[in-house]
Protein backbone atom coordinates (compact mmCIF):
# COMPACT_ATOMS: atom_id res chain seq x y z
CA UNK A 1 0.00 0.00 0.00
CA UNK A 2 1.24 3.48 -0.89
CA UNK A 3 1.79 5.90 1.96
CA UNK A 4 -0.05 9.23 1.94
CA UNK A 5 2.17 12.10 0.75
CA UNK A 6 1.29 15.52 -0.65
CA UNK A 7 1.21 15.91 -4.41
CA UNK A 8 4.25 17.86 -5.69
CA UNK A 9 3.53 21.29 -7.09
CA UNK A 10 2.29 21.26 -10.69
CA UNK A 11 1.74 17.49 -10.79
CA UNK A 12 -1.95 17.38 -9.90
CA UNK A 13 -3.62 15.35 -12.68
CA UNK A 14 -6.25 17.36 -14.58
CA UNK A 15 -7.17 14.39 -16.75
CA UNK A 16 -6.32 10.74 -17.16
CA UNK A 17 -3.72 10.70 -19.92
CA UNK A 18 -0.41 9.15 -20.91
CA UNK A 19 1.63 11.59 -18.82
CA UNK A 20 0.60 9.48 -15.80
CA UNK A 21 2.86 6.59 -16.86
CA UNK A 22 5.78 8.77 -15.79
CA UNK A 23 4.39 9.11 -12.25
CA UNK A 24 5.82 7.03 -9.45
CA UNK A 25 3.31 5.01 -7.44
CA UNK A 26 3.24 7.52 -4.59
CA UNK A 27 2.68 10.36 -7.06
CA UNK A 28 -0.28 8.57 -8.62
CA UNK A 29 -1.73 8.05 -5.16
CA UNK A 30 -1.20 11.69 -4.22
CA UNK A 31 -1.96 13.43 -7.50
CA UNK A 32 -4.82 11.54 -9.15
CA UNK A 33 -8.28 12.35 -7.85
CA UNK A 34 -10.36 9.18 -7.49
CA UNK A 35 -13.51 10.90 -8.76
CA UNK A 36 -11.65 12.05 -11.88
CA UNK A 37 -10.41 8.51 -12.40
CA UNK A 38 -13.95 7.14 -12.05
CA UNK A 39 -15.34 9.48 -14.70
CA UNK A 40 -12.47 8.84 -17.11
CA UNK A 41 -12.04 5.09 -16.64
CA UNK A 42 -12.45 4.49 -20.38
CA UNK A 43 -9.10 6.25 -20.95
CA UNK A 44 -7.13 3.86 -18.77
CA UNK A 45 -7.32 1.14 -21.41
CA UNK A 46 -5.46 3.28 -23.93
CA UNK A 47 -2.53 3.92 -21.58
CA UNK A 48 0.21 1.30 -21.08
CA UNK A 49 0.34 1.49 -17.30
CA UNK A 50 2.53 -0.96 -15.38
CA UNK A 51 0.80 -3.57 -13.24
CA UNK A 52 2.10 -1.73 -10.17
CA UNK A 53 0.52 1.51 -11.37
CA UNK A 54 -2.76 -0.30 -12.00
CA UNK A 55 -2.66 -1.50 -8.38
CA UNK A 56 -2.58 2.14 -7.26
CA UNK A 57 -5.50 3.09 -9.54
CA UNK A 58 -7.52 0.16 -8.22
CA UNK A 59 -6.74 1.21 -4.66
CA UNK A 60 -8.07 4.69 -5.40
CA UNK A 61 -11.33 3.28 -6.77
CA UNK A 62 -11.65 0.97 -3.76
CA UNK A 63 -11.37 3.95 -1.43
CA UNK A 64 -13.96 5.91 -3.41
CA UNK A 65 -16.41 2.98 -3.59
CA UNK A 66 -15.93 0.80 -0.50
CA UNK A 67 -19.38 -0.79 -1.03
CA UNK A 68 -18.58 -1.77 -4.62
CA UNK A 69 -18.16 0.08 -7.91
CA UNK A 70 -21.16 1.52 -9.79
CA UNK A 71 -21.91 -0.01 -13.18
CA UNK A 72 -20.79 3.16 -14.98
CA UNK A 73 -17.27 2.47 -13.71
CA UNK A 74 -17.43 -1.33 -14.06
CA UNK A 75 -18.32 -1.09 -17.75
CA UNK A 76 -15.11 0.81 -18.48
CA UNK A 77 -12.70 -1.14 -16.28
CA UNK A 78 -10.99 -2.71 -19.27
CA UNK A 79 -7.83 -4.55 -18.29
CA UNK A 80 -8.11 -3.19 -14.73
CA UNK A 81 -10.76 -5.93 -14.37
CA UNK A 82 -7.91 -8.45 -14.25
CA UNK A 83 -6.81 -6.81 -11.00
CA UNK A 84 -10.16 -7.47 -9.31
CA UNK A 85 -10.62 -10.29 -6.84
CA UNK A 86 -13.79 -12.41 -6.57
CA UNK A 87 -14.42 -10.61 -3.27
CA UNK A 88 -14.38 -7.24 -5.09
CA UNK A 89 -16.77 -8.54 -7.74
CA UNK A 90 -19.25 -9.91 -5.19
CA UNK A 91 -19.91 -6.30 -4.18
CA UNK A 92 -21.00 -5.35 -7.70
CA UNK A 93 -24.46 -5.16 -9.17
CA UNK A 94 -24.03 -5.81 -12.89
CA UNK A 95 -27.28 -5.63 -14.86
CA UNK A 96 -26.25 -4.61 -18.37
CA UNK A 97 -25.31 -7.26 -20.93
CA UNK A 98 -23.01 -4.66 -22.51
CA UNK A 99 -21.05 -4.45 -19.26
CA UNK A 100 -20.78 -8.23 -19.10
CA UNK A 101 -19.55 -8.38 -22.71
CA UNK A 102 -16.97 -5.65 -22.11
CA UNK A 103 -15.48 -7.52 -19.17
CA UNK A 104 -15.57 -10.94 -20.84
CA UNK A 105 -13.69 -9.37 -23.76
CA UNK A 106 -10.82 -8.55 -21.39
CA UNK A 107 -10.42 -12.22 -20.49
CA UNK A 108 -10.94 -13.45 -24.06
CA UNK A 109 -8.78 -16.36 -25.10
CA UNK A 110 -8.02 -17.37 -21.52
CA UNK A 111 -9.57 -20.04 -19.33
CA UNK A 112 -12.50 -18.92 -17.21
CA UNK A 113 -10.88 -17.28 -14.19
CA UNK A 114 -12.41 -17.16 -10.68
CA UNK A 115 -13.11 -13.47 -11.35
CA UNK A 116 -15.07 -14.23 -14.51
CA UNK A 117 -16.94 -17.09 -12.84
CA UNK A 118 -17.95 -14.74 -10.01
CA UNK A 119 -18.96 -12.01 -12.45
CA UNK A 120 -21.18 -14.41 -14.43
CA UNK A 121 -22.72 -15.77 -11.24
CA UNK A 122 -23.56 -12.23 -10.03
CA UNK A 123 -25.01 -11.31 -13.42
CA UNK A 124 -27.17 -14.41 -13.83
CA UNK A 125 -28.45 -14.22 -10.23
CA UNK A 126 -29.32 -10.57 -10.80
CA UNK A 127 -31.35 -11.49 -13.89
CA UNK A 128 -33.09 -14.38 -12.17
CA UNK A 129 -32.63 -16.74 -15.11
CA UNK A 130 -30.34 -17.54 -18.01
CA UNK A 131 -32.15 -15.74 -20.82
CA UNK A 132 -31.27 -16.34 -24.47
CA UNK A 133 -29.13 -13.20 -24.95
CA UNK A 134 -27.07 -13.97 -21.86
CA UNK A 135 -26.59 -17.58 -22.87
CA UNK A 136 -25.65 -16.49 -26.40
CA UNK A 137 -23.01 -14.18 -24.97
CA UNK A 138 -21.60 -16.65 -22.44
CA UNK A 139 -21.34 -19.58 -24.82
CA UNK A 140 -19.71 -17.33 -27.44
CA UNK A 141 -16.90 -16.57 -24.99
CA UNK A 142 -16.88 -19.93 -23.19
CA UNK A 143 -18.31 -22.81 -25.25
CA UNK A 144 -18.15 -25.09 -22.19
CA UNK A 145 -20.09 -22.69 -19.99
CA UNK A 146 -23.37 -24.58 -20.01
CA UNK A 147 -21.71 -27.81 -18.90
CA UNK A 148 -20.07 -26.02 -15.97
CA UNK A 149 -23.49 -25.46 -14.39
CA UNK A 150 -25.07 -27.86 -11.93
CA UNK A 151 -28.37 -29.58 -12.86
CA UNK A 152 -30.06 -27.27 -10.34
CA UNK A 153 -28.65 -24.18 -12.06
CA UNK A 154 -29.59 -25.55 -15.48
CA UNK A 155 -33.18 -25.89 -14.35
CA UNK A 156 -33.42 -22.08 -14.49
CA UNK A 157 -32.66 -22.08 -18.23
CA UNK A 158 -35.90 -21.29 -20.08
CA UNK A 159 -36.63 -23.48 -23.14
CA UNK A 160 -36.46 -20.38 -25.36
CA UNK A 161 -32.75 -20.04 -24.49
CA UNK A 162 -31.99 -23.48 -25.88
CA UNK A 163 -32.01 -21.99 -29.39
CA UNK A 164 -28.71 -20.32 -28.54
CA UNK A 165 -26.98 -23.62 -27.77
CA UNK A 166 -24.54 -25.03 -30.33
CA UNK A 167 -23.47 -28.72 -30.42
CA UNK A 168 -19.97 -27.87 -29.17
CA UNK A 169 -21.47 -26.15 -26.12
CA UNK A 170 -22.60 -29.58 -24.88
CA UNK A 171 -19.37 -31.49 -25.48
CA UNK A 172 -18.43 -31.69 -21.81
CA UNK A 173 -21.92 -32.14 -20.36
CA UNK A 174 -22.51 -35.27 -18.30
CA UNK A 175 -25.75 -37.34 -18.38
CA UNK A 176 -27.23 -35.56 -15.35
CA UNK A 177 -26.93 -32.22 -17.12
CA UNK A 178 -28.39 -33.58 -20.35
CA UNK A 179 -31.28 -35.06 -18.36
CA UNK A 180 -32.20 -31.48 -17.45
CA UNK A 181 -31.51 -29.93 -20.85
CA UNK A 182 -33.19 -32.56 -23.06
CA UNK A 183 -36.81 -31.89 -22.01
CA UNK A 184 -36.20 -28.16 -22.52
CA UNK A 185 -34.80 -28.79 -25.99
CA UNK A 186 -37.72 -31.08 -26.84
CA UNK A 187 -40.10 -28.31 -25.87
CA UNK A 188 -38.10 -25.62 -27.70
CA UNK A 189 -37.96 -27.56 -30.98
CA UNK A 190 -41.39 -29.21 -30.84
CA UNK A 191 -42.81 -27.29 -33.82
CA UNK A 192 -40.05 -28.28 -36.23
CA UNK A 193 -40.51 -30.98 -38.86
CA UNK A 194 -38.80 -34.38 -38.64
CA UNK A 195 -35.39 -33.89 -40.23
CA UNK A 196 -34.92 -30.34 -38.94
CA UNK A 197 -36.02 -31.43 -35.48
CA UNK A 198 -33.46 -34.23 -35.43
CA UNK A 199 -30.62 -31.90 -36.43
CA UNK A 200 -31.45 -29.60 -33.52
CA UNK A 201 -32.24 -32.25 -30.89
CA UNK A 202 -29.31 -34.53 -31.73
CA UNK A 203 -26.81 -32.89 -29.35
CA UNK A 204 -29.25 -33.22 -26.44
CA UNK A 205 -30.16 -36.90 -26.95
CA UNK A 206 -27.88 -38.03 -24.12
CA UNK A 207 -30.84 -37.09 -21.92
CA UNK A 208 -33.56 -38.80 -24.01
CA UNK A 209 -35.77 -41.58 -22.55
CA UNK A 210 -36.51 -44.87 -24.33
CA UNK A 211 -39.92 -43.84 -25.64
CA UNK A 212 -38.41 -40.83 -27.46
CA UNK A 213 -35.73 -43.03 -29.04
CA UNK A 214 -38.44 -45.46 -30.17
CA UNK A 215 -40.33 -42.55 -31.74
CA UNK A 216 -37.18 -41.34 -33.53
CA UNK A 217 -36.60 -44.83 -34.92
CA UNK A 218 -39.83 -44.44 -36.88
CA UNK A 219 -38.61 -41.26 -38.60
CA UNK A 220 -35.66 -42.42 -40.77
CA UNK A 221 -33.23 -40.19 -38.87
CA UNK A 222 -30.01 -42.18 -39.55
CA UNK A 223 -28.37 -41.41 -36.21
CA UNK A 224 -24.58 -41.58 -36.33
CA UNK A 225 -22.65 -43.89 -34.01
CA UNK A 226 -21.06 -41.01 -32.07
CA UNK A 227 -24.53 -39.83 -31.03
CA UNK A 228 -25.71 -43.38 -30.31
CA UNK A 229 -22.73 -44.00 -28.01
CA UNK A 230 -23.69 -40.96 -25.92
CA UNK A 231 -27.24 -42.17 -25.27
CA UNK A 232 -28.24 -43.23 -21.78
CA UNK A 233 -27.62 -46.96 -21.32
CA UNK A 234 -30.93 -47.39 -19.52
CA UNK A 235 -32.70 -45.74 -22.47
CA UNK A 236 -31.01 -47.97 -25.06
CA UNK A 237 -31.46 -51.34 -23.33
CA UNK A 238 -35.21 -51.74 -24.02
CA UNK A 239 -34.83 -51.00 -27.74
CA UNK A 240 -35.34 -53.97 -30.04
CA UNK A 241 -32.89 -54.93 -32.77
CA UNK A 242 -35.37 -53.69 -35.37
CA UNK A 243 -35.68 -50.31 -33.60
CA UNK A 244 -31.91 -49.85 -33.37
CA UNK A 245 -31.58 -50.79 -37.04
CA UNK A 246 -34.17 -48.17 -38.00
CA UNK A 247 -32.64 -45.60 -35.66
CA UNK A 248 -29.13 -45.96 -37.11
CA UNK A 249 -30.07 -46.64 -40.72
CA UNK A 250 -26.88 -47.09 -42.77
CA UNK A 251 -24.78 -46.42 -39.67
CA UNK A 252 -25.89 -49.72 -38.11
CA UNK A 253 -22.71 -51.34 -39.45
CA UNK A 254 -20.74 -49.28 -36.92
CA UNK A 255 -22.16 -51.39 -34.07
CA UNK A 256 -19.56 -54.08 -34.76
CA UNK A 257 -16.67 -51.75 -33.96
CA UNK A 258 -18.39 -50.68 -30.73
CA UNK A 259 -19.64 -54.08 -29.54
CA UNK A 260 -17.38 -54.06 -26.46
CA UNK A 261 -18.29 -50.55 -25.36
CA UNK A 262 -21.32 -49.23 -23.50
CA UNK A 263 -24.14 -48.87 -24.31
CA UNK A 264 -23.74 -51.29 -27.26
CA UNK A 265 -22.20 -54.06 -25.12
CA UNK A 266 -25.01 -53.96 -22.56
CA UNK A 267 -27.64 -53.73 -25.29
CA UNK A 268 -26.26 -56.83 -27.07
CA UNK A 269 -26.49 -58.82 -23.82
CA UNK A 270 -30.24 -58.05 -23.71
CA UNK A 271 -31.03 -59.13 -27.29
CA UNK A 272 -31.82 -62.60 -28.63
CA UNK A 273 -28.88 -63.89 -30.61
CA UNK A 274 -31.06 -64.81 -33.58
CA UNK A 275 -32.35 -61.21 -33.70
CA UNK A 276 -28.77 -59.92 -33.68
CA UNK A 277 -27.89 -62.36 -36.46
CA UNK A 278 -30.46 -60.70 -38.72
CA UNK A 279 -28.18 -57.64 -38.84
CA UNK A 280 -25.47 -59.74 -40.50
CA UNK A 281 -22.72 -57.96 -38.56
CA UNK A 282 -21.41 -60.92 -36.59
CA UNK A 283 -22.44 -59.42 -33.25
CA UNK A 284 -21.99 -62.02 -30.47
CA UNK A 285 -23.10 -62.22 -26.86
CA UNK A 286 -26.86 -62.21 -27.24
CA UNK A 287 -29.26 -64.53 -25.42
CA UNK A 288 -29.04 -68.01 -26.96
CA UNK A 289 -32.10 -69.33 -28.75
CA UNK A 290 -34.49 -71.30 -26.55
CA UNK A 291 -33.66 -69.37 -23.38
CA UNK A 292 -36.48 -67.68 -21.48
CA UNK A 293 -35.89 -64.05 -20.50
CA UNK A 294 -37.44 -62.92 -17.25
CA UNK A 295 -37.79 -59.19 -16.65
CA UNK A 296 -37.23 -59.17 -12.89
CA UNK A 297 -38.03 -55.50 -12.57
CA UNK A 298 -41.48 -56.21 -14.00
CA UNK A 299 -41.91 -59.20 -11.67
CA UNK A 300 -41.08 -57.06 -8.64
CA UNK A 301 -43.56 -54.44 -9.75
CA UNK A 302 -46.34 -57.06 -10.00
CA UNK A 303 -45.63 -58.50 -6.57
Amino acid sequence: EVEKTACPSGKKAREIDESLIFYKKWELEACVDAALLATQMDRVNAIPFTYEQLDVLKHKLDELYPQGYPESVIQHLGYLFLKMSPEDIRKWNVTSLETLKALLEVNKGHEMSPQVATLIDRFVKGRGQLDKDTLDTLTAFYPGYLCSLSPEELSSVPPSSIWAVRPQDLDTCDPRQLDVLYPKARLAFQNMNGSEYFVKIQSFLGGAPTEDLKALSQQNVSMDLATFMKLRTDAVLPLTVAEVQKLLGPHVEGLKAEERHRPVRDWILRQRQDDLDTLGLGLQGGIPNGYLVLDLSMQEALS
Epitope: E18, N45, A46, P48, F49, G78, Y79, A102, E105
Partner: nanobody, 118 residues
Framework: LQLVESGGGLVQPGGFLRLSCAAS????????IGWFRQAPGKEREGVSY????????NYADSVKGRFTISRDNAKNTVYLQMNSLKPEDTGVYSC????????????WGQGTSVTVSS
Protein backbone atom coordinates in the same frame (compact mmCIF):
# COMPACT_ATOMS: atom_id res chain seq x y z
CA LEU B 1 1.28 -13.01 -29.02
CA GLN B 2 4.19 -11.13 -27.55
CA LEU B 3 6.49 -8.12 -27.60
CA VAL B 4 10.21 -8.70 -28.03
CA GLU B 5 12.77 -6.03 -27.12
CA SER B 6 16.28 -5.92 -28.53
CA GLY B 7 19.20 -3.53 -28.93
CA GLY B 8 20.42 -3.35 -25.35
CA GLY B 9 24.03 -3.72 -24.32
CA LEU B 10 27.01 -2.10 -22.64
CA VAL B 11 27.80 1.46 -23.66
CA GLN B 12 30.06 4.24 -22.35
CA PRO B 13 28.65 7.46 -20.88
CA GLY B 14 27.79 9.87 -23.70
CA GLY B 15 27.20 6.97 -26.07
CA PHE B 16 24.00 5.93 -27.79
CA LEU B 17 21.79 2.87 -28.33
CA ARG B 18 18.68 2.17 -30.36
CA LEU B 19 16.18 -0.20 -28.76
CA SER B 20 13.52 -2.03 -30.75
CA CYS B 21 10.17 -3.36 -29.60
CA ALA B 22 8.73 -5.80 -32.14
CA ALA B 23 5.31 -7.42 -31.99
CA SER B 24 4.86 -11.01 -32.99
CA UNK B 25 1.42 -12.55 -33.53
CA UNK B 26 -0.50 -9.28 -33.58
CA UNK B 27 -0.46 -5.89 -35.30
CA UNK B 28 0.91 -2.92 -33.38
CA UNK B 29 -1.05 -0.34 -35.42
CA UNK B 30 -3.87 -0.04 -32.92
CA UNK B 31 -1.73 0.04 -29.79
CA UNK B 32 -0.20 2.84 -27.79
CA ILE B 33 3.30 1.89 -26.67
CA GLY B 34 5.21 2.80 -23.55
CA TRP B 35 8.89 2.21 -22.78
CA PHE B 36 9.74 1.55 -19.14
CA ARG B 37 12.93 0.86 -17.30
CA GLN B 38 13.81 -0.71 -14.00
CA ALA B 39 17.16 -0.27 -12.26
CA PRO B 40 18.19 -2.91 -9.70
CA GLY B 41 16.28 -2.40 -6.46
CA LYS B 42 14.25 0.49 -7.87
CA GLU B 43 10.64 0.94 -8.90
CA ARG B 44 9.90 0.48 -12.58
CA GLU B 45 9.49 3.90 -14.21
CA GLY B 46 7.99 5.20 -17.42
CA VAL B 47 10.49 6.55 -19.93
CA SER B 48 8.59 7.31 -23.12
CA TYR B 49 5.19 6.99 -24.80
CA UNK B 50 3.87 7.01 -28.35
CA UNK B 51 0.22 6.97 -29.39
CA UNK B 52 -1.21 4.37 -31.79
CA UNK B 53 -1.10 6.84 -34.68
CA UNK B 54 2.38 8.07 -33.78
CA UNK B 55 1.04 11.61 -33.65
CA UNK B 56 1.55 12.02 -29.92
CA UNK B 57 4.74 11.34 -27.95
CA ASN B 58 5.76 12.03 -24.38
CA TYR B 59 8.86 11.60 -22.23
CA ALA B 60 9.90 11.46 -18.60
CA ASP B 61 11.63 14.67 -17.52
CA SER B 62 14.89 12.78 -16.94
CA VAL B 63 15.21 11.77 -20.62
CA LYS B 64 13.67 14.74 -22.45
CA GLY B 65 15.93 16.01 -25.23
CA ARG B 66 18.06 12.85 -25.18
CA PHE B 67 15.59 10.04 -26.04
CA THR B 68 13.33 9.82 -29.09
CA ILE B 69 10.49 7.35 -29.57
CA SER B 70 9.19 6.45 -33.03
CA ARG B 71 7.21 3.71 -34.72
CA ASP B 72 7.24 1.89 -38.03
CA ASN B 73 3.87 0.19 -38.36
CA ALA B 74 4.94 -1.48 -41.62
CA LYS B 75 7.66 -3.28 -39.66
CA ASN B 76 5.37 -3.77 -36.64
CA THR B 77 8.07 -2.19 -34.48
CA VAL B 78 8.55 0.74 -32.11
CA TYR B 79 12.00 2.25 -31.51
CA LEU B 80 13.65 4.12 -28.67
CA GLN B 81 16.70 6.11 -29.78
CA MET B 82 18.80 6.89 -26.70
CA ASN B 83 21.52 9.52 -27.04
CA SER B 84 23.92 11.12 -24.52
CA LEU B 85 23.51 8.14 -22.22
CA LYS B 86 24.28 8.52 -18.50
CA PRO B 87 25.09 5.91 -15.83
CA GLU B 88 21.66 6.57 -14.29
CA ASP B 89 20.04 5.31 -17.51
CA THR B 90 21.22 1.80 -16.61
CA GLY B 91 18.44 -0.75 -16.21
CA VAL B 92 16.24 -3.30 -17.93
CA TYR B 93 14.15 -1.58 -20.61
CA SER B 94 10.80 -3.12 -21.52
CA CYS B 95 7.95 -2.03 -23.74
CA UNK B 96 4.22 -2.31 -23.15
CA UNK B 97 1.28 -2.09 -25.54
CA UNK B 98 -2.22 -0.95 -24.59
CA UNK B 99 -5.16 -1.29 -26.94
CA UNK B 100 -7.47 1.55 -26.14
CA UNK B 101 -11.22 1.69 -25.68
CA UNK B 102 -13.00 -1.43 -26.91
CA UNK B 103 -9.71 -3.33 -27.07
CA UNK B 104 -8.64 -4.59 -23.70
CA UNK B 105 -5.61 -6.55 -24.84
CA UNK B 106 -2.28 -5.45 -23.45
CA UNK B 107 1.16 -6.91 -23.81
CA TRP B 108 4.49 -6.67 -22.01
CA GLY B 109 7.90 -7.66 -23.30
CA GLN B 110 10.58 -9.46 -21.27
CA GLY B 111 13.00 -6.55 -21.51
CA THR B 112 16.51 -5.82 -22.78
CA SER B 113 19.36 -4.80 -20.51
CA VAL B 114 21.17 -1.47 -20.87
CA THR B 115 24.35 -0.77 -18.93
CA VAL B 116 26.01 2.66 -19.11
CA SER B 117 29.48 2.44 -17.62
CA SER B 118 33.02 3.44 -18.37
Amino acid sequence: LQLVESGGGLVQPGGFLRLSCAASGFTLDYYAIGWFRQAPGKEREGVSYISSSGGSTNYADSVKGRFTISRDNAKNTVYLQMNSLKPEDTGVYSCAAAGGYGNSSRYWGQGTSVTVSS
